[in-house]
């Protein structure tokens, strides 16, 4: 429906306090390196205006556009050029041109200082003096360093972390309180990040069609009783949400993810039975649960499907009469039949039928061409099985820390190229799905396994995608979106890659690394381990053991010494060598 | 509640048209392949035709020309026109879901039926 | 195709096994439906896909069969069962057919 004032319009219906949150967000994530201060500012003059239009929608400019208005507003920051340079050309387009360039200049890797938790008594001081600031200050922090954070569960974050900090302020033991819930919303945070990532990749680089397949495999495996024409309305719903928070449109998302849960349990009785907990929630709650809900029973009764899609005679001309319908309605009932597939793996599937019917209804015998077809399938559904299985022994065998450094060096030697915090990074979070997925019984494992890998390569792919250097990991990421794990996993040892030179500073540890977390342990480590494998590719596991074993022996060492920094520089120099001579360097 | 409901039976005469309407209650009929069939007083079903998700319709041999499928999806009901009547037209006439908007069968979802009489 | 179903009618008593044969023209797979119905009433699902047993209904009705042959047996005839049976093809196109029926009437 067209409203007199759009601003209006999505301030009355989000309320102030949404409004607020979700314009800072919005200019936070689109101007990452402005000062809290200054987005506030802008908040605020932002926010005064809306009220003028709520009071009179037809008072002068209440009738722009919101890219209108809000890219006006980031324009008139005063530091544009000297703080990002060419974003400042932005300026000089006009709509929609303009908010497009600003989407293109959001940087997945911002060069931030990284967040530093004070002391709980600081925080809960800072959450006493000033709740409105301090909690706006978490968004802002959070939506700069994360350019494509899901606006609306932001909010629900932020709701979680007003009631850590309401609760354990006032606990007996605030920091026993207050700290595994930060650290529980980090974590979370995190992931959600990166799916959300993945969702705004596949709109933007693989298009809107990519996304609505990805949903119908989805839904119809989290709702399989629910029948084609529910789920196409909901992959519609779902994909107009995701494409406005994706393109920076975050009031109307937030707006339209309100609507679409309200209907989604005003309908449950044709959605799914396990919708009842979450539609009793308020709506921050109610939204986050939805996307949450664990998968419906399959319902009874359930043909093969063999007799509409293989062996009945008229698939070239339902095909041809209705490819949308027809390859849709073939994903959702393989998908609602399936919950024990991935949905990369059910995509697959699909694609794998749709060109056997562009090529087989082309033919002379079509049914005869096609009659195999679900046979091409069992190849493409044991490959990620096996993989799944493969790792998950090597997982357990391993524990996480050690099954990460193997996953480094693999990686390390596919795409030795890529930066070492990258890879780093990627691997660690590669490794994380033994202890994520590996839990879980047979039927559960593939769609955690390789869905989740699917959200860490593409971490891969976007930070590769800002200063590209490696042009099998561009091959990877840009082919097939559905492909990208198969295609990762195909990669043999780079045997274009010139060892890089030994530089032994890289390897030079100081005392500092005593006082360090063991997971900032871990990183270090980890750090040195690509660093071994880019210098010496062809080392075997055995040498890089080695290695390895006698750099913790070290590190343990030093840290217990009286004199750790002397330890460190004199052991440190001995291990370098020791370490070049065992690799032959 | 899920259910079809069939109307627009009667007696009509030789040469004479009618249309069938079936209601669906508690679905979305657009989800589904939507089938009519027949039964002479006493005698056999007898598939007339369906029509699919991607609005194909398909007949019966015999059906062909004188029967037609159509569907309106705002009004969740879908309707079989028959043309040229003759006596042996005569039966219930029912509608049935498909198993999927491309299925020619199992239907495991039925209306009760609409009596058609053709005679002078 | 074509779908021959026999005997047209059966007479039988409370308790008995009965079997009831479909035979198609030609090889439809496992794409046979059975269907029991009563006078003034739709036809009910039993089985599909040849052997797999409609949800609520009772466990004595089992189906078997694929290609061209197939069987309905009721393991023990309950007084309810007495009624029509047709099986159904289905799958080989986007056409169907349906069995002349099997009366199963009380002896």
């Known amino acids: 429906d067209a409203h007199k004032s759009e601003v209006a319009h999505r301030f009355k219906d989000l309320g102030e306090e949404n409004f607020k949150a979700l314009v800072l967000i919005a200019f936070a994530q689109y101007l990452q390196q402005c000062p809290f201060e200054d987005h506030v500012k802008l908040v605020n003059e932002v926010t005064e205006f809306a009220k003028t239009c709520v009071a009179d929608e037809s008072a002068e400019n209440c009738d722009k556009s919101l890219h209108t208005l809000f890219g006006d507003k980031l324009c008139t920051v005063a530091t544009l050029r000297e703080t990002y340079g060419e974003m400042a050309d932005c300026c000089a387009k006009q709509e929609p041109e303009r908010n497009e360039c600003f989407l293109q200049h959001k940087d997945d890797n911002p060069n931030l200082p990284r967040l530093v938790r004070p002391e709980v008594d600081v925080m809960c001081t800072a959450f006493h003096d000033n709740e409105e600031t301090f909690l706006k200050k978490y968004l802002y922090e959070i939506a700069r360093r994360h350019p494509y954070f899901y606006a609306p569960e932001l909010l629900f974050f932020a709701k979680r972390y007003k009631a850590a900090f309401t609760e354990c302020c006032q606990a007996a033991d605030k920091a026993a309180c207050l700290l595994p819930k930060l650290d529980e919303l980090r974590d979370e945070g995190k992931a959600s990040s990166a799916k959300q990532r993945l969702k705004c990749a596949s709109l933007q680089k693989f298009g809107e069609r990519a996304f609505k397949a990805w949903a119908v495999a989805r839904l119809s495996q989290r709702f399989p009783k629910a029948e084609f024409a529910e789920v196409s309305k909901l992959v519609t719903d779902l994909t107009k949400v995701h494409t406005e928070c994706c393109h920076g449109d975050l009031l109307e998302c937030a707006d339209d993810r309100a609507d679409l849960a309200k209907y989604i349990c005003e309908n449950q009785d044709s959605i799914s039975s396990k919708l009842k907990e979450c539609c009793e929630k308020p709506l921050l709650e109610k939204s986050h649960c939805i996307a949450e809900v664990e998968n419906d029973e399959m319902p009874a009764d359930l043909p093969s499907l063999a007799a509409d899609f293989v062996e009945s005679k008229d698939v070239c001309k339902n095909y041809a009469e209705a490819k949308d319908v027809f390859l849709g309605m073939f994903l959702y009932e393989y998908a609602r039949r399936h919950p024990d597939y991935s949905v990369v793996l059910l995509l697959r599937l699909a694609k794998t039928y749709e060109t056997t019917l562009e090529k087989c209804c082309a033919a002379a015998d079509p049914h005869e061409c096609y009659a195999k077809v679900f046979d091409e399938f069992k190849p493409l559904v044991e490959e990620p099985q096996n993989l799944i299985k493969q790792n998950c022994e090597l997982f357990e065998q391993l524990g996480e820390y050690k099954f990460q450094n193997a996953l480094l060096v693999r990686y390390t030697k596919k795409v030795p190229q890529v930066s070492t915090p990258t890879l780093v990074e990627v691997s660690r979070n590669l490794g994380k799905v033994g202890s994520k997925c590996c839990k879980h019984p047979e039927a559960k494992r593939m769609p955690c396994a390789e869905d989740y890998l699917s959200v860490v390569l593409n971490q891969l792919c976007v930070l590769h995608e800002k200063t590209p250097v490696s042009d099998r990991v561009t091959k990877c990421c840009t082919e097939s979106l559905v492909n990208r794990r198969p295609c990762f996993s195909a990669l043999e040892v780079d045997e274009t890659y010139v060892p890089k030179e030994f530089n032994a500073e890289t390897f030079t540890f100081h005392a500092d690394i005593c006082t360090l977390s063991e997971k900032e342990r871990q990183i270090k480590k980890q750090t040195a381990l690509v660093e071994l494998v880019k210098h010496k590719p062809k080392a075997t596991k055995e040498q890089l053991k080695a290695v390895m074993d006698d750099f913790a022996a070290f590190v343990e060492k030093c840290c217990k010494a009286d004199d750790k920094e002397t330890c460190f520089a004199e052991e440190g120099k001995k291990l370098v060598a020791a370490s070049q001579a065992a690799l032959g360097l | 509640e899920v259910q079809l409901v069939e109307s627009g039976g009667g007696l009509v005469q030789p040469g004479g048209s009618l249309r069938l309407s079936c209601a669906a209650s508690?679905?979305?009929?657009?989800?589904?392949?939507m089938n009519w069939v027949r039964q002479a007083p006493g005698k056999c079903l007898e598939w007339i035709g369906h029509i699919n998700a991607g609005d194909i319709a398909y007949y019966a041999t015999w059906a062909k020309g004188r029967f037609t499928i159509s569907r309106d999806n705002s009004k969740n009901t879908v309707y079989l026109q028959m043309n040229s009547l003759r006596a042996e037209d005569t039966a219930v006439y029912f509608c049935?879901?498909?198993?999927?908007?491309?299925?020619?069968?199992?239907?495991?979802?039925w209306g009760q039926g609409t009596l058609v009489t053709v005679s002078s | 195709f074509e779908l021959t179903q026999s005997p047209s009618s059966l007479s039988a008593s409370v308790g008995d096994r009965v079997t009831i044969t479909c035979q198609a023209s030609e090889s439809i797979n496992s794409r046979l439906a059975w269907y029991q119905q009563k006078p003034g009433q739709p036809p009910k699902l039993l089985i599909y896909d040849a052997s797999d047993l409609t949800s609520g209904v009772p466990s004595r009705f089992s189906g078997s069969g694929s290609g061209t042959d197939f069987t309905l047996t009721i393991s023990s005839l309950q007084p309810e069962d007495f009624a029509t049976y047709y099986c159904?093809?289905?799958?080989?196109?986007?056409?169907?057919?349906f069995g002349c029926g099997t009366k199963l009437t009380v002896l």
């Open positions: 508690g679905f979305s009929l657009s989800s589904y392949a």
């Open positions: 159904q093809g289905y799958g080989g196109s986007s056409t169907t057919t």
């Open positions: 049935a879901r498909g198993a999927g908007g491309f299925s020619t069968g199992p239907f495991k979802l």
